[in-house]
């Protein structure tokens, strides 16, 4: 939602967290600001303090409950407001009617591990974190492998169009150090976006056996 010169963007992690970023042209000096969440059909409301992330943008996480608790559903609408202190009062700086399951961004996949590694291939698995049971199998993944001498941006994206929490990387070079990352996205939601990339998993392929081509 945009109000005046500000941009207010929030995402729901599908369980118990709404993360928000508010950016404002002509940054407010020494002003306390917060995000206030007011669901239309729940007894609770929640507030978080916006903290600066750059010259003109602030971020905060609305913690709605225990990490794996299902605090919102597809029918919920949450009024989200940015409030900034002016004198003794709060001023509404931005406001949006937030539909959580239209604005999803899951947590980065966790527990990456090498299941099996050979000279030319490596099987890697991972787990999704704090993802709603509502999705069932309606998730997709993107993965990328960092090769020596390249950057993450240059790494080709591998797309897994189903809920598959493993991958078999092939055509790798023997005795070579690689890094691997994966991210997840639900199929649901008009404004849904990819999760952050997972922490990179470093692995090394096995050296080729002497005098043998494996």
């Amino acid at each position: 939602a945009v109000n005046g010169t500000s941009q207010f963007t929030c995402f729901y992690n599908s369980r118990a967290n709404i993360s928000c970023v508010w950016s404002q042209d002509g940054a407010l000096q020494d002003t306390s600001c917060q995000v206030h969440a007011w669901p239309d059909r729940r007894r609770w409301n929640q507030t978080c303090e916006l903290l600066p992330v750059s010259q003109a943008s602030w971020a905060c996480n609305l913690i709605l409950g225990a990490p794996d608790s299902q605090k919102l559903t597809t029918v919920d609408i949450v009024t989200l407001r940015v409030l900034c202190r002016e004198g003794v009062r709060w001023r509404v700086m931005a406001i949006q009617d937030f539909k959580p399951f239209e604005n999803l961004r899951l947590m980065a996949p966790i527990s990456l591990q090498v299941v099996h590694v050979e000279t030319h291939r490596c099987n890697i698995s991972w787990e999704i974190s704090q993802a709603s049971h509502y999705f069932e199998r309606h998730l997709e993944f993107e993965a990328r492998t960092l090769s020596p001498g390249h950057t993450w941006e240059e790494a080709p994206l591998l797309t897994l169009k189903q809920k598959q929490e493993w991958i078999c990387l092939e055509t790798l070079t023997p005795d070579t150090q690689y890094e691997f990352q994966v991210r997840v996205k639900p199929l649901q939601g008009e404004f849904t976006t990819w999760s952050p990339w997972s922490q990179p998993l470093a692995f090394r392929t096995k050296p080729a056996a002497l005098g043998k081509d494996t």
């Epitope: 109000n3 005046g4 010169t5 500000s6 404002q24 042209d25 002509g26 407010l28 409030l83 002016e86 004198g87 003794v88 009062r89 709060w90 001023r91 509404v92 700086m93 931005a94």
Partner: antibody, heavy 121, light 112 residues
Framework: EVQLVQSGAEVKKPGASVKVSCKAS????????ISWVRQATGQGLEWMGE????????YYNEMFKGRVTMTRDTSISTAYMELSSLRSEDTAVYYC??????????????WGQGTTVTVSS | DVVMTQSPLSLPVTLGQPASISCRSS???????????LEWFQQRPGQSPRLLIY???NRFSGVPDRFSGSGSGTDFTLKISRVEAEDVGVYYC?????????FGGGTKVEIK
Amino acid sequence: EVQLVQSGAEVKKPGASVKVSCKASGYTFTDYVISWVRQATGQGLEWMGEIYPGDGNTYYNEMFKGRVTMTRDTSISTAYMELSSLRSEDTAVYYCARGSYTYDNYAMDFWGQGTTVTVSS
Amino acid sequence: DVVMTQSPLSLPVTLGQPASISCRSSQNIVHSNGNTYLEWFQQRPGQSPRLLIYKVSNRFSGVPDRFSGSGSGTDFTLKISRVEAEDVGVYYCFQGSHIPWTFGGGTKVEIK
């Protein structure tokens, strides 16, 4: 019905202090801000500052800083405005007014009846 | 501080006729959230101020629809479509966009 009832008229000597009260009823006192506005005889309105009774937090117009003190007593839903080092130009009607804690629409909706303060030697 | 200048100082009007009051701010009073916190108050003789209009053009509850507000940036107007006897008094504009909040000097509406 929202009501703000202020204390009676005061006559003070220059250099003295005056304390005006504003008793609120008809709403939850600690949910709204109380602003203070003054009107010198035949003059316009001047915003002095405000207090949030919920936590006692105050904000004063620079013009009055050091001379004005705003307090509240939540047990009797009353706000106070004390002005010190009075001079003749402080002769005015002093108003309290209610305001929303979240300023989304307007600053002040309901006003007290006003308290006349006369500063004269 | 934002200086609010009203004109005219005095406005003699005929009952049933329209009236218009101007208010000009010394600087733009659009708040950084995009809203313009320009309000109009009416003060009848011997009474406290009463909120008429907020955010330039919104009538406060109970305010007759003969009162309307308009304007943007630094220039604002309060109009009374057909003046009635009970409209006599002083009208003040007020800006709540930039602390310290400030009032105009007032316009006295009287019947000819």
